[in-house]
């Protein structure tokens, strides 16, 4: 069932002060304004459900307009400990400390939280992205340097009466935004401590969080335009499936990606797209306003439900998986990048998926909820959907059990 439980304190249906508190765009991340230190220093912070450190630029960098100046904060405390976070491409490193943190367009509270002051980085900050740090909202297990470093959200829940839940509505523009438009545009909402019913339509459907590290879920079936990919469901979750607001694309394991592309190609075969398009290298363009959305299939991911042998499906449109890109050379056209890509670390349900839905990270009940977003881009013929229940057997078998090695070798 959709489990529309009675309203609880902190789960009232309206969080007006938090609505529209995100800015940005899917290609460069969504950020929230936060203040750090005393007196408060304002920074824009990337909202990332795929990591667990609160880390901010703390030294000059060519891509940063501003940075956290610890020496100006009377409440900063040095933990006398370094932190080094390597990614597959790039890295950041810094010094650990704590300070007072608040979210101006969030709950009216101030918490003392761990902060990694980034002193050196490579391929981490993005030129023109307008954010200066990252808010890792996942669990302590993947925090760096180890799971003893309490993540921000854990500190928030421990120190205040904020319920252990947050929800995200990421709003893809549906068209490319230039720099000034991004600064002026609304990117969506992060509702801390509750669910805002104005941000979605229909019902919320919940899938269990398989394990509290990343926000790991289990996909039990994949369909392209209603056609089952017919793969062993373990392949969909090899080696995990996560919900990650800090990733742009829908990323799929190699075998799944190849099968999905083959199926999407077949469904859209009325036009011949270059190989480079499917790799995310070439853009495809149409005369402004003539994008043939109808030739592209919908994609459905079936997720394990809360009840035994019950699943539900989330369906995205090409308006979500074709990402608008501005190119001066073809400015008279509407141009797009294919925003589904190959992964060697499992399925990543990034902004491409999240922009279709209001997503509830119900940590208290170890589940993630999906409902159709009130701001998703669609056309007059099709809309994103969250539907169920469906009968699906042996769903537990769809989860992949990662051999128990040291998980701290996190590579994003």
């Amino acid at each position: 069932e959709t489990d529309e439980e009675p309203e609880e304190p902190g789960r009232r249906g309206s969080f007006v002060e938090m609505v529209d508190n995100l800015r940005g765009k899917s290609g460069q991340g969504y950020y929230v304004e936060m203040t750090v230190g005393s007196p408060p220093q304002t920074l824009n912070i990337l909202v990332d459900t795929g990591s667990s450190n609160f880390a901010v630029g703390a030294a000059p960098h060519p891509f940063l307009h501003r940075y956290y100046q610890r020496q100006l904060s009377s409440t900063y405390r040095d933990l006398r400990k370094g932190v080094y976070v390597p990614y597959t491409q790039g890295k950041w490193e810094g010094e650990l400390g704590t300070d007072l943190v608040s979210i101006p367009h969030g709950p009216n509270v101030t918490v003392r939280a761990n902060i990694a002051a980034i002193t050196e980085s490579d391929k981490f900050f993005i030129n023109g992205s307008n954010w200066e740090g990252i808010l890792g909202l996942a669990y302590a297990e993947i925090a760096r340097p180890d799971d003893s470093l309490e993540p921000f959200f854990d500190s928030l829940v421990k120190q205040t009466h904020v319920p252990n839940l947050f929800s995200l509505q990421l709003c893809g523009a549906g068209f490319p935004l230039n720099q000034s438009e991004v600064l002026a545009s609304v990117g969506g909402s992060m509702i801390i401590g509750g669910i805002d019913h104005s941000l979605y339509t229909g019902s919320l459907w919940y899938t269990p969080i398989r394990r509290e590290w990343y926000y790991e879920v289990i996909i039990v079936r994949v369909e392209i335009n209603g056609q089952d990919l017919k793969m062993d469901c373990k392949e969909y979750n090899y080696d995990k499936s996560i919900v990650d607001s800090g990733t742009t694309n829908l990323r799929l394991p190699k075998k799944v990606f190849e099968a999905a592309v083959k199926s999407i190609k077949a469904a859209s075969s009325t036009e011949k797209f270059p190989d480079g398009f499917w790799l995310g290298e070439q853009l495809v363009c149409w005369q402004a306003g003539t994008t043939p959305w109808n030739i592209f299939p919908v994609i459905s991911l079936y997720l394990m439900g809360e009840v035994t042998n019950q699943s539900f499906r989330i369906t995205i449109l090409p308006q979500q998986y074709l990402r608008p890109v501005e190119d001066v050379a073809t400015s008279q056209d509407d141009c797009y990048k294919f925003a589904i890509s190959q992964s060697s670390t499992g399925t990543v349900m990034g902004a491409v998926i999240m922009e279709g839905f209001y997503v509830v990270f119900d940590r208290a009940r170890k589940r993630i909820g999906f409902a159709v977003s009130a701001c998703h881009v669609h056309d007059e013929f099709r809309t994103a959907a969250v539907e169920g229940p469906f009968v699906t057997l042996d769903m537990e078998d769809c989860g992949y059990n990662i051999p128990q090695t040291d998980e701290s070798t996190l590579m994003t």
């Epitope: 491409q89 036009e271 011949k272 797209f273 070439q282 001066v328 050379a329 073809t330 141009c335």
Partner: antibody, heavy 116, light 107 residues
Amino acid sequence: EVQLQQSGPELVKPGASVKLSCKASGYTFTNFWIHWLKQRPGQGLEWIGMIDPSDSYTKYNQKFKAKATLTVDTSSSTTYMHLSSLTSEDSAVYYCARSGVAFPYWGQRTLVTVSA
Amino acid sequence: DIVMTQSQKFMSTSVGDRVSVTCKASQNVGTNVAWYQQKPGQSPKALIYSASHRYSGVPDRFTGSGSGTDFTLTISNVQSEDLAEYFCQQYNSYMYTFGGGTKLEIK
């Protein structure tokens, strides 16, 4: 304005190696792949390979796989091509080009001369 | 690899004339063809994409046509500054390949 600024001409000895650079400006660097091409008189344009600045993923023309190595530095919006074990066959004009639909933008050319 | 053949290596034309440069692909490439202009000592300049779409800023005397295997670049009302070599390119599949070029000479 989109610009691809290539490094200057190179005169190198046979057997040596060389690293060419291509600095991009005027657009979001990680949004578009960078390609490298070779042009010799009377032999037309040859595609060497390409790199995705967002994650350094590369794809090469099989012919150049042992010859060329593409790398990227996002902090300076610069792409590099390293050419190894140079012979007279590698004497050519080299271009970087930015993807989009086909190659809408090209660097201004780098002449490599391999000579003893 | 897909071979792109420009059978005419040279073409002669006069200012004000209309000239057509042709290109043939060894297999179906849909409309995934681009045309470039290269003047002596310069880099190629992109003219046409998707067989018939002009890049921003390209004069409308340049038009492209064709699909499948046969493609044409037409320059109407040829100007003296059009003296250059013209290349076709298929970007339908890797490896990306180019035609051998057609040099346009102004009489």
